[in-house]
């Protein structure tokens, strides 16, 4: 019968020919006139046989990532009779892996959004690299992830590529971060190949800022002839948050005379001071009221940032009008 060994060829061999192995029949004692033949895809081109000895050589550089095995057929003929010595047999030449492919991040670009002030350990995103080398061949495709840029705010789990928060971040100080992740094969050992990817991490706003009045005192005037409902001036607060978290409501905190009201312009986020009752210069020529401002939407969990509302004092002077 055929005497079989496993046939392997390392990929990317630079030699002009590489000895793969030898076809042999156990009937071949060296004194026979046995001629070995190689058939199938790759025979005569990729693989050449010395028909006199059965020695098979690879004469082309092979790429395992392109083709990992070749199925060939062997024949052996006794040239004295012209007959087959053994039945034709199929066998495999495997292309063995070398570490010739670097890890690649296939899902680039990576972008993630995470709420500001998220606690340490919060999962941001998972990045995954692929390595075309053989995962069953040593460590050629075993990857380790590391952080090249992004400390101290982020960390990456070495084996999973999961990026987590390692330090709280304030969107109002910096609203986005570029993190650079490296994947190394050979589990980072010498001779490892690497690939990198960038991750844009944006911080989404949480309502961690209360609105604060720009001025602690506003001076307004109102004519004694002004009808009720007249807008006599505006006040304004600022909020470092954005969007819904910066929406605010103004209100009167103190107005003993109950003469004034404040309504909120939700487009401009201003407070409009309105005359609720007519005023009379001769009766009272000035008023002092206190206004307060609060966010429109406050999450229960963020109440600690909103315990005391910002207030401002408004002095209103009544203008005299000549009466007939």
């Amino acid at each position: 019968g055929w005497v079989w060994n496993q046939f392997f060829v390392p990929e990317e061999m630079n030699t002009t020919s590489h000895h793969v192995g030898r076809l042999r029949s156990d009937l071949d004692n060296g004194n026979n006139s046995f001629q070995y033949k190689l058939l199938g895809a790759g025979a005569g081109s990729t693989f050449i046989i010395d028909e006199r000895t059965g020695d098979i050589y690879a004469i082309e550089k092979l790429d395992r990532e392109e083709r990992s095995l070749y199925i060939l057929r062997a024949q052996v003929i006794d040239i004295t009779t012209g007959r087959a010595v053994e039945p034709e047999s199929e066998f495999v030449i495997k292309v063995s892996d070398i570490n010739d492919n670097e890890p690649k991040f296939l899902d680039e670009p990576y972008e993630a959004i995470v709420p500001e002030m998220s606690p340490e350990g919060t999962l941001v995103i998972q990045v995954t690299a692929s390595d075309a080398d053989d995962p069953s061949s040593g460590n050629n495709a075993r990857l380790l992830y590391s952080l090249l840029q992004g400390q101290p705010y982020f960390s990456v789990e070495p084996t999973t590529g999961v990026i987590r928060i390692s330090s709280k971040m304030d969107r109002e100080l910096q609203d986005e971060y570029w993190v650079i992740i490296q994947a190394k094969d050979m589990i980072g050992q010498p001779g490892a190949l690497s690939g990198t990817t960038s991750v844009l991490i944006k911080l989404s706003d949480v309502n961690d800022n209360k609105p604060i009045f720009k001025e602690s005192l506003y001076r307004l005037t109102v004519s004694e002839s002004a009808p009720t409902g007249t807008s006599i001036g505006t006040i304004m607060a600022y909020d470092n948050d954005i969007g819904e978290n910066a929406e605010m409501d103004y209100s009167i905190e103190e107005d003993d005379s109950q003469t004034f009201d404040i309504i909120t312009n939700h487009e401009t986020q201003e407070g409009i001071v309105i005359l609720k009752k007519k005023v009379n210069f001769e009766h009272q020529n000035h008023y002092g009221i206190r206004a307060k401002v609060k966010n429109h939407h406050v999450d229960e969990q963020l109440m600690k940032y909103h315990t005391e509302a910002s207030t401002t004092f408004i002095k209103i002077q009544v203008e005299d009008v000549d009466e007939p």
Partner: antibody, heavy 120, light 108 residues
């Protein structure tokens, strides 16, 4: 047409190693078997062995332990190394082309031969 | 290995005569894988016959080969002056390849 030319030392000391080179011109070394044959003075021819262009070799069992052959397809050359020389290795050494793929064939063409004398 | 015995060792003939050279193998030579060569002093052998009976390119038809199995013959029908040389047989049906000891054809 294909021509072969042997080159190497004419005189070698006993116990030393002989190195000969055969240069092929007028055709490619690839695709063929290449043999070395020797002829002691006044005697018959002896096949030493062959090398295939891919590097596969087969040597005469009588010399196998002392013979090494190599091939350089880029230079269109093949070589013979014979170690532990004695006076019995004194001969004219020929290189010749065997067939292309397949079973053994006759030798054609031949180099003109080079005389190697083993003497101290 | 197959041992080839050539006879006679020397053949003395005159130009124009017929020469018959014998090559006997110690065992059957596969598929008549036998060649004949001519060698002149100081020269390399020159292929005459292969496959026991096929003439090589450029070989005159006065040279012919025959035989099979273990007995092979080279015949030169009418010797020309340039034919006086040593003739070798060689088998290539089995490894190692072997040559006969040679037959010298000399002028009588």
């Amino acid at each position: 047409q294909v021509q072969l030319q042997e080159s190497g030392p004419g005189l070698v000391k006993p116990s030393e190693t002989l190195s000969l080179t055969c240069t092929v011109s007028g055709g490619s070394i690839s695709g063929y078997y290449w043999s070395w044959i020797r002829q002691p003075p006044g005697k018959g021819l002896e096949w030493i062995g062959y090398i295939y262009y891919i590097g596969s070799t087969n040597y005469n069992p009588s010399l196998k332990s002392r013979v090494t052959m190599s091939i350089d397809t880029s230079k269109n050359q093949f070589s013979l190394t014979l170690s532990s020389l004695t006076a019995a290795d004194t001969a004219v050494y020929f290189c010749a082309r065997d067939g292309s793929s397949g079973w053994y064939r006759w030798f054609d063409p031949w180099g003109q031969g080079t005389l190697v004398t083993v003497s101290s | 290995e197959i041992v080839l015995t050539q006879s006679p060792g020397t053949l003395s003939l005159s130009p124009g005569e017929r020469a018959t050279l014998s090559c006997r193998a110690s065992q059957s030579v596969s598929s008549s894988y036998l060649a004949w060569y001519q060698q002149k002093p100081g020269q390399a052998p020159r292929l005459l016959i292969f496959g026991a009976s096929s003439r090589a390119t450029g070989i005159p038809d006065r040279f012919s080969g025959s035989g099979s199995g273990t007995d092979f013959t080279l015949t030169i029908s009418g010797l020309e002056p340039e034919d006086f040389a040593v003739y070798h047989c060689q088998q290539y049906g089995n490894s190692p390849l072997t040559f006969g000891g040679g037959t010298k054809v000399e002028i009588k």
